[in-house]
């Protein structure tokens, strides 16, 4: 009963987890305009993965995509990389969860196949929620990066170089949502892996014997209880692997202001 | 078509108060925000604040603070410019103007003259 | 605040001929979000209210005759009136529209020669 609970559990943790990533991921604030210490502006910016977007005091909102794929900075994409990554896999450990499921009956689905596919969704959803988490930060990295930098920034404007000041960014409400959501991922993959141990079937390495008394019929089944001593022949190896999900700390040249339009 | 439609000229003594309406037609009030323009006789324009009526949000510059009270009334869809405690140098026309896309005032109001004279 | 600065005060041009207009903002009017100046420009005539002539800077607003045109980027800024005509005679004033307080030019009045 506390295994199907903690597999249910996970699974539903998971799920939310999942969708927060999608959601994170689609949504346009992952970085906003700083506006403390900051004139106050009738135009506000905010900016996401895919496009950047003003907002005005008239309430007209113009949003841009970002249509160069190589223009934009290495550290984007990767964060664009990192999400997809994390979607697909928690989609596909979502998809193997379900039918993982000890409530849900397919078949006549061994107890051991549905605790290898409990422990694969739990190994995806780790990966899956590290690569959300890993995403979203390294972003952030960049904002605090690029926030320190130069507050003055040239343009060639109409008349020729232009003095204006730097937009500041800080951080969107995505970026929190990314978190949580990546945070929930791997809380709920961890309930999967925990699951999949009480899934598992447990063999004796012991025989039921009976013992034939030469007057008497009476048979003696030693092992009346079951101790899991963790001895038995279930003695597979359930290794959690974290997917090789590396971040390597190269020097980047960062571009002046965080605006990939 | 869109109208901005003002009330007519006041005269007032210093001291008293006056109720500038303007009245919005041939579009949805809550959508867009009323701005307030004032023009002292020869003198250039001067913005004095807005109002949002879908959020609620008011906003004055700096020499508008006090006295000077921006409100609605998104039933009749009119906004109001209430003067308080008056001054002769606030004899001047008052404008209000729609802001719409870009930031621009693309509608204006007639103009109401205030005259401050004891 | 931000100060915008108008020249000349006032202009006497014939008819026919080029007028123009300058402006200039005590800070940068230039949004990188969308790399839109948020500066407009707006005709008064005596008697009436302004009328909305350029916003962002260049993009001219429904019904405007054609011969009005801005240009400018970050703190510079120009009206150009290429061919004056008689109801041209007004008060242009220059306005930004991207910090608060809004501010507005101190106006050029513009006369026929």
């Known amino acids: 009963m506390a295994v199907t609970a903690c597999q249910g559990l996970g699974f539903v943790v998971s799920l939310i987890g999942i969708a927060g990533i999608i959601a994170a991921t689609c949504m346009d604030q992952w970085s906003t305009q700083d506006l403390y210490n900051n004139p106050v502006t009738a135009v506000f910016n905010y900016q996401g993965l895919w496009r950047s977007c003003v907002r005005e005091s008239s309430g007209f909102t113009e949003c841009r995509g970002y249509f160069t794929l190589l223009g934009l900075p290495a550290m984007l994409q990767a964060v664009r990389a990192l999400m997809i990554v994390g979607i697909v896999l928690g989609a596909i450990g979502l998809l193997v969860s379900i039918f993982a499921l000890k409530c849900i009956r397919i078949g006549s689905m061994e107890d051991s196949a549905k605790a290898n596919m409990t422990l694969t969704s739990g190994i995806m959803f780790i990966v899956s929620g590290l690569c959300a988490i890993a995403g979203v930060s390294v972003f952030a990295n960049m904002l605090v990066t690029n926030f320190w930098m130069s507050t003055a920034n040239m343009y060639t404007g109409m008349g020729g170089m232009v003095q204006t000041v730097q937009t500041r960014y800080t951080f969107g409400a995505a970026l929190f949502v990314g978190w949580v959501a990546g945070g929930l991922t791997l809380i709920g993959g961890v309930m999967m892996c925990i699951a999949c141990r009480g899934l598992a079937p447990e063999e004796t390495n012991y025989k039921a014997v009976s013992y034939h008394a030469s007057g008497h019929s009476v048979a003696y089944k030693p092992g009346g209880f079951k101790a899991s001593t963790g001895f038995g022949s279930n003695t597979k190896n359930k290794k959690i692997y974290d997917g090789g999900a590396r971040t390597e700390d190269e020097v980047q040249s960062y571009p002046s202001k965080h605006d990939y339009v | 078509q869109i109208q901005l439609v003002q009330s007519g000229s006041e005269l007032k003594k210093p001291g008293a108060s006056v109720k500038v309406s303007c009245k919005a037609s041939?579009?949805?009030?809550?959508?867009?925000?009323i701005n307030w323009v004032r023009q002292a006789p020869g003198q250039g324009l001067e913005w004095m604040g807005w109002i949002n009526p879908n959020t609620g949000e008011t906003t004055y510059a700096e020499g508008f603070t006090g006295r000077f009270v921006l409100s609605w009334d998104t039933s009749v869809s009119t906004a109001y410019l209430q003067i308080s405690s008056l001054k002769a140098e606030d004899t001047a026309v008052y404008f209000c103007a729609r802001l719409y896309y870009g930031n621009r005032f693309d509608s204006w109001g007639q103009g109401t003259l205030v005259t401050v004279s004891s | 605040d931000i100060v915008m600065t108008q020249s000349p005060d006032s202009l006497a041009v014939s008819l026919g001929e080029r007028a123009t207009i300058n402006c200039k903002s005590s800070q940068s009017l230039l949004n990188s979000g969308n790399q839109r100046n948020y500066l407009a420009w707006y005709q008064q005539k005596p008697g009436q209210p302004p009328k909305l002539l350029i916003y962002?800077?260049?993009t001219r607003e429904s019904g405007v005759p054609d011969r009005f045109s801005g240009s400018g980027s970050g703190t510079d800024f120009t009206l150009t009136i290429s061919s004056l005509q008689a109801e041209d005679v007004a008060v242009y004033y220059c306005?930004?529209?991207?910090?608060?307080?809004?501010?507005f030019g101190g106006g050029t009045k513009v006369e026929i020669k």
């Open positions: 962002w800077a260049s």
């Open positions: 306005q930004q529209a991207y910090y608060y307080p809004l501010t």
């Open positions: 041939g579009y949805t009030f809550t959508n867009y925000g």
